[in-house]
């Protein structure tokens, strides 16, 4: 058992491209850092992995498809988020968000367990960011990016908890 | 509404250094991010640089490792340093700020101009 970190969240929906400047920025503290993630403030677009039948991010050929900066082709900073679960293990999710360069990993929790969060475990996988959020904020955000809309999340560094009991999966 | 002030352009011979300065004011959200793109004589504009929610810097290949962007957030202001400049380099040069995210079209300045001479 260790001690937890909360994370702050600061997350805005938009409609891209529309040309409507409105904006909702909506601050919680819905988090949890992973007890191997660096404890760091990371800001980006939230990007699910492609496919229909890849949200657990367990095949190691799991993609995902980046937005870019205006009127260019560079990459802006973005956020993997995956769901719990699918049969690997926490470090294999983030380790893989790393590899295809997120600058962090959300990873949400399994459907009923509504706002749960636990704390990961994931030795080996400590180069990006990775906090868990709640199923019922996850799906919030995976069904707003099915619809098109562009969901950017800020992280910021909460408060000190624990201990809790780890999990690696 | 945003308004952008860019400053700091020039002639310069092959080799040397600028640094360009843009100062927003008006509507600006917390989580703005600015930036420059170019337009050459001819050209379309291009992306050069930006840095988004003061955290994350994206550079144009053509440019990396001798353009450095950053921001003074305290005075809404973006800095483009631009160092070992090649006569390629000469355009006008435009700020461009978002009050979303730097995906979405941007706010443009009216530009400064920017001549490399070999």
């Known amino acids: 058992a260790e001690a937890v970190w909360t994370a702050y969240l600061n997350v805005s929906w938009r409609v891209p491209h529309t040309g409507v400047n409105r904006t909702v920025w909506e601050l919680s503290e819905e988090g949890v850092y992973g007890q191997d993630s660096p404890l760091e403030p990371v800001a980006g677009v939230l990007v699910p992995p492609d496919g229909p039948g890849a949200l657990n991010a367990c095949n190691p050929h799991t993609n995902f498809t980046v937005p870019t900066v205006w009127g260019s082709t560079v990459q802006v900073s973005w956020l993997a988020l995956i769901q719990r679960g699918g049969g690997c293990t926490f470090a294999d999710k983030i380790h893989l968000a790393y590899e295809r360069g997120a600058s962090g990993a959300v990873i949400f929790n399994f459907p009923g367990t509504r706002n749960e969060v636990i704390p990961m475990s994931h030795p080996g996988a400590v180069d990006i960011v990775a906090i868990m959020i709640g199923n019922l904020k996850g799906t919030k955000i995976l069904q707003s990016i099915q619809r098109g809309i562009q969901v950017t999340m800020v992280i910021e560094v909460g408060k000190k908890h624990g201990p809790w009991v780890n999990h690696y999966s | 509404q945003v308004q952008l002030q860019e400053s700091g352009g020039g002639l310069v011979q092959a080799g040397g250094s600028l640094r360009l300065s843009c100062a927003a004011s008006?509507?600006?959200?917390?989580?703005?991010?600015m930036g420059w793109y170019r337009q050459a004589p001819g050209k379309e504009r291009e992306f050069v640089a930006a840095i988004d929610l003061g955290t994350s810097t994206y550079y144009a290949d053509s440019v990396k490792g001798r353009f450095t962007i950053s921001r003074d957030n305290a005075k809404n202001t973006v800095y483009l340093q631009m160092n070992s400049l090649k006569p390629e380099d000469t355009a006008v040069y435009y700020c461009?700020?978002?009050?979303?995210?730097?995906?979405?079209?941007?706010?443009w300045g009216q530009g400064t101009q920017v001549t490399v001479s070999s």
């Open positions: 461009a700020a978002w009050s979303d995210y730097v995906t979405e079209l941007p706010y």
């Open positions: 008006g509507t600006i959200s917390y989580y703005y991010a």
